[in-house]
């Protein structure tokens, strides 16, 4: 069987369909969840929906073979199989591997380290989100793009604040957290600022090493 991969965001409505036309005048068509759990079957001109976790949120289009699933959740991750029984008794099957991902949560930026080193300021920030498999990208005045959860940089003495943005993303969504840092290097926590909620399109968080229990929201 042919295998197609699909990645969608949780809570969305999904159409599972094949890119080719169905065999002409097929006898029966069945959608399975995994190898053998029937979801819906078309036979003798009518659709039969089976008792399953999909009942009430799926619909079959017998013309195209498309299966519509509403409000998909991560638990719907699976390989879906459409098997068609043709008039001559031969079968055709198509498989769709559905991956349902939650939108990434807003990242928390944590100050891991901040110290004076030879008149320069060594800064180590980490971008934290709870238990997700995501991609990280840091933006700001950096020698090169950093693509992991930790940013380490050494700042020359400067008068103006520097801002660093951590972008977390998966294949269905992305969110940013931005941290702005003002000299001197070991200044009080109040001098570290977050970009305002409006600029970021949502509330962001900063956690300093010294004060893990008090989040600063702006």
């Amino acid at each position: 069987g042919r295998l197609v991969h699909m990645t969608v965001v949780s809570g969305s409505n999904v159409t599972l369909n094949i890119s080719e036309s169905l065999p002409e005048n097929y006898k029966q068509l069945t959608w399975f969840y995994t190898f053998d759990q029937k979801i819906v079957e078309w036979d003798s001109g009518k659709s039969k929906y089976f008792e399953s976790k999909f009942k009430g949120r799926v619909r079959l289009d017998p013309q195209s073979g498309a299966l519509y699933i509403s409000k998909v959740q991560k638990e719907d991750n699976s390989t879906y199989v459409m098997r068609v029984l043709k008039k001559d008794g031969y079968e055709q099957e198509w498989k769709i591997k559905l991956q349902v991902l939650d939108p990434v949560p807003k990242p928390v930026i944590k100050i891991e380290k901040r110290e004076d080193v030879d008149d320069n300021c060594y800064l180590k920030l980490s971008c934290v989100i709870p238990g997700e498999s995501v991609n990280y990208t840091w933006y700001g005045e950096l020698p090169k793009e950093i693509q992991n959860s930790v940013l380490e940089t050494t700042l020359k003495p400067h008068k103006h604040s520097r801002c660093y943005t951590c972008q977390v993303s998966n294949s269905v969504s992305s969110k940013n957290g931005t941290f702005c840092f003002s000299p001197p290097c070991t200044a009080a926590r109040s001098e570290q600022k977050l970009i305002s909620e409006e600029d970021l399109g949502g509330e962001q968080k900063l956690i300093s090493e010294e004060d893990l229990h008090h989040h600063h929201h702006h």
């Epitope: 069987g1 029966q28 036979d43 008794g89 079968e91």
Partner: antibody
């Protein structure tokens, strides 16, 4: 033309295991299923399980769960069925059948397995 | 598991006779039913799939009908080569289950 070619007769002692092979020769299918069905002397047909060598999916009848295993060698288009902890009641002809999910349009000639002390 | 019950368990008929075998499923199986013929010492052979579709190469004197729970295999004019045991099998669900078989003998 497509054939399912099975391994030869086996004689086993109670408690032993048997491994029967089934080779799909002449097939050009990208996707096919192999079922195993057995028939005790003078008895009817009993379905044991199904495997899809292409994606590794298997499903066994509850009765055999825990002592049956279906494996495959895709390079030689051969499927294997191993049954362990043999009892005299396992004396039967073991058929592989396929190549469809629903119906068995093709059958091997059967492998007689005798379990006797 | 779905139980499949065949009747009669055996039938003896003459060449040219019409022979009917019935198969009842313990629950609705739509038209997911197959009929097989088995001759002594041989593997079964698919006759009918999807309750009423004739497998390629099978003589047209064999026909199948029914849906839901009640199914019939009919041999319209029995031929000498039609002796053997006939099995129905549901393919709606796992485990696939067979009827106990109907032995057809020629008078």
């Amino acid at each position: 033309q497509v054939q399912l070619v099975q391994s030869g007769a086996e004689v086993k002692k109670p408690g032993a295991s048997v491994k029967v092979s089934c080779k799909a020769s002449g097939h050009t299918f990208t996707n096919y299923y192999i079922h195993w069905v057995r028939q005790a002397p003078g008895q009817g047909l009993e379905w044991m399980g199904i495997t899809n060598p292409n994606d590794g999916n298997t499903r066994y009848a509850q009765k055999f769960q825990g002592r049956i295993s279906m494996t495959w060698d895709t390079s030689t288009s051969t499927v294997f069925m191993e049954l362990s902890s043999l009892k005299s009641e396992d004396t039967a002809v073991y058929y592989c059948a396929g190549l469809r999910y629903w119906f068995f349009d093709l059958w091997g000639r059967g492998t007689p397995v005798t379990v006797s002390s | 598991d779905i139980q499949m019950t065949q009747s009669p368990s055996s039938v003896s008929a003459s060449v040219g006779d019409r022979v009917t075998i019935t198969c009842r499923a313990s629950q609705d199986i739509s038209s997911w039913l197959a009929w097989y013929q088995q001759k002594p010492g041989k593997a079964p052979n698919l006759l009918i799939f999807a309750a009423s579709s004739l497998q390629s190469g099978v003589p047209s004197r064999f026909s199948g009908s029914g849906s839901g729970t009640d199914f019939t295999l009919t041999i319209s004019s029995l031929q000498p080569e039609d002796f053997g045991t006939y099995y129905c099998q549901q393919t709606d669900n796992f485990p696939r289950t067979f009827g106990q078989g109907t032995k057809v003998e020629i008078n």
